[in-house]
Interface confidence: medium
């Protein structure tokens, strides 16, 4: 099955095209409006980009976030946006780019050891970690190295890559995000931001692992637009 | 400690109207998705639905589809169930849960009968 | 929807036990599963989530096992409180679904 396929990291309901099918099989979703929803079991990536509309930063790819496209804009037309990188202005973690964070407004890397006591609170309770700084205006508590060993284990609740373990990221699972798996070579991968298929991606795949890239698997070149399938791939 | 309350049950007519609350305190609310459950007296246990921590996206059982409608009032950390069009088979103990059901709450329960 | 199948519906054992109950899913749900202990008048207590890993504050007598469609939840060595009703429950794919139970009782 698909599942097996992705080690974890199933999608199993792509966004449809715009005015396709909305709905997942057997459940009801809804959202705000303009918004669709995943239909069938299609793969719809396709290379060339254009602004996705989303609602909140789950729904964008693990390299970007959402927001207004213009500084003060109609809170109400908002897309994915690319990461920000390191010493570039943020106001929340999820405008960094995968590995920084969001401290003071400016993304930092999240590879110093005393990120993790600086961001978390009491944490070792549930699944995995549980923070009070989604909103970006981390808390100073500074907790002992003891801690820094509660990294999420697959399956997880998460609200960061930084928050699971080595190997696995942070992707989104129905209405939370969990610890799935980083994407092998040779797995399915999604390339975000499809033209005219626009919609939640209820779930997310985790991006390819280090020293590989989401490309069209080669023999899938001539297929068309629509049914063109990525896959991890070595650089 | 994460705390999970949940209060609104009570007696009601088929085809009456409830509306469920759950509050939240001990973890930061708006970051986690959250989910109602329920059990029939005696039976065993079924998702009735699920909200994204903004509440944007909201996912439900077919059992209730159009007739209940689950929400969330992040300033308030509170979790809402409205049910509406009740039905005898709705008799259950309702619980709400955090994320894939990691916490829960007591549960209320909602008698449906004439 | 994704059908949980539990066995047995219930059992009989001793402290000291060793126990198994186990959980089939219709189709593949990967590690997406949960294993849950219920005491009467009591909600649902998290044991096991993704299958193998064991919540917090959970004894390390309980463990789970299994990925796909078989899914298995032991209990090393029974204690007194251990008797209760055990459920899984799938969350690959909404709705998000529960075995029927299996009731863990006295000998």
């Known amino acids: 099955t698909l599942n097996s396929v992705l080690n974890s990291n199933a999608i199993k309901n792509l966004p449809p095209p715009l005015g396709g099918a909305a709905g997942h099989p057997g459940s009801a979703v809804s959202a705000a409006p303009g918004i669709l929803y995943p239909g069938g079991n299609k793969y719809q990536t396709i290379d060339n980009y254009q602004p996705y509309p989303c609602a909140e930063d789950e729904e964008c790819g693990t390299d970007e976030y959402c927001a207004s496209p213009t500084r003060g804009g109609d809170a109400g037309v908002q897309i994915c946006l690319a990461c920000r990188k390191r010493r570039k202005r943020c106001m929340r973690h999820a405008m960094c780019c995968p590995g920084n964070y969001c401290k003071n407004g400016i993304c930092v890397s999240s590879d110093q050891n005393h990120f993790r006591g600086e961001i978390e609170e009491t944490i070792t309770e549930s699944f995995g970690n549980d923070h009070s700084t989604l909103d970006g205006y981390s808390r100073r508590t500074t907790l002992s190295s003891k801690m820094y060993h509660t990294k999420g284990q697959e399956g997880s609740v998460c609200l960061r890559s930084s928050d699971c373990a080595s190997g696995l990221c942070c992707a989104r699972h129905f209405w939370s995000k969990i610890c799935k798996p980083v994407l092998k070579e040779g797995q399915v991968c999604t390339k975000h931001r499809r033209k005219g298929s626009h919609g939640l991606e209820i779930f997310q795949r985790c991006y390819c692992g280090e020293g590989l890239s989401c490309r069209i698997q080669k023999d899938h070149h001539q297929a068309s637009n629509s049914s063109r399938l990525h896959t991890c791939q070595r650089h | 400690q994460v705390q999970l309350v949940e209060s609104g049950g009570g007696l009601v007519q088929p085809g009456g109207s409830l509306r469920l609350s759950c509050a939240a305190s001990?973890?930061?609310?708006?970051?986690?998705?959250m989910s109602w459950v329920r059990q029939a007296p005696g039976k065993g246990l079924e998702w009735v639905s699920g909200?994204?921590?903004?509440?944007?996206?909201?996912y439900y059982a077919d059992s209730v589809k159009g007739r209940f409608t689950i929400s969330r009032d992040n300033s308030k950390n509170t979790l809402y169930l409205q049910m509406n069009s009740l039905r005898a088979e709705d008799t259950a103990v309702y619980y709400c849960?955090?994320?894939?059901?990691?916490?829960w709450g007591q549960g209320t329960l909602v008698t449906v009968s004439s | 929807d994704i059908q949980m199948t539990q066995s047995p519906s219930s059992l009989s054992a001793s402290v000291g036990d060793r126990v198994t109950i186990t959980c089939r899913a219709s189709?593949?749900?990967?590690?997406?599963l949960h294993w849950y202990q219920q005491k009467p008048g009591k909600a649902p207590k998290l044991l096991i989530y993704?299958?193998?890993n064991l919540q917090s504050g959970v004894p390390s007598r309980f463990s789970g096992s299994g990925s796909g469609t078989d899914f298995t939840l032991t209990i090393s060595s029974l204690q007194p409180e251990d008797f209760a009703v055990y459920y899984c429950?799938?969350?690959?794919?909404?709705?998000?679904?529960f075995g029927q139970g299996t009731k863990v009782e006295i000998k």
């Open positions: 849960a955090r994320h894939y059901m990691d916490h």
């Open positions: 001990g973890f930061t609310f708006s970051s986690y998705g």
């Open positions: 909200i994204s921590g903004s509440g944007s996206y909201t």
């Open positions: 189709q593949d749900i990967s590690n997406y």
């Open positions: 993704g299958a193998s």
């Open positions: 429950q799938q969350y690959d794919s909404i709705p998000m679904t």
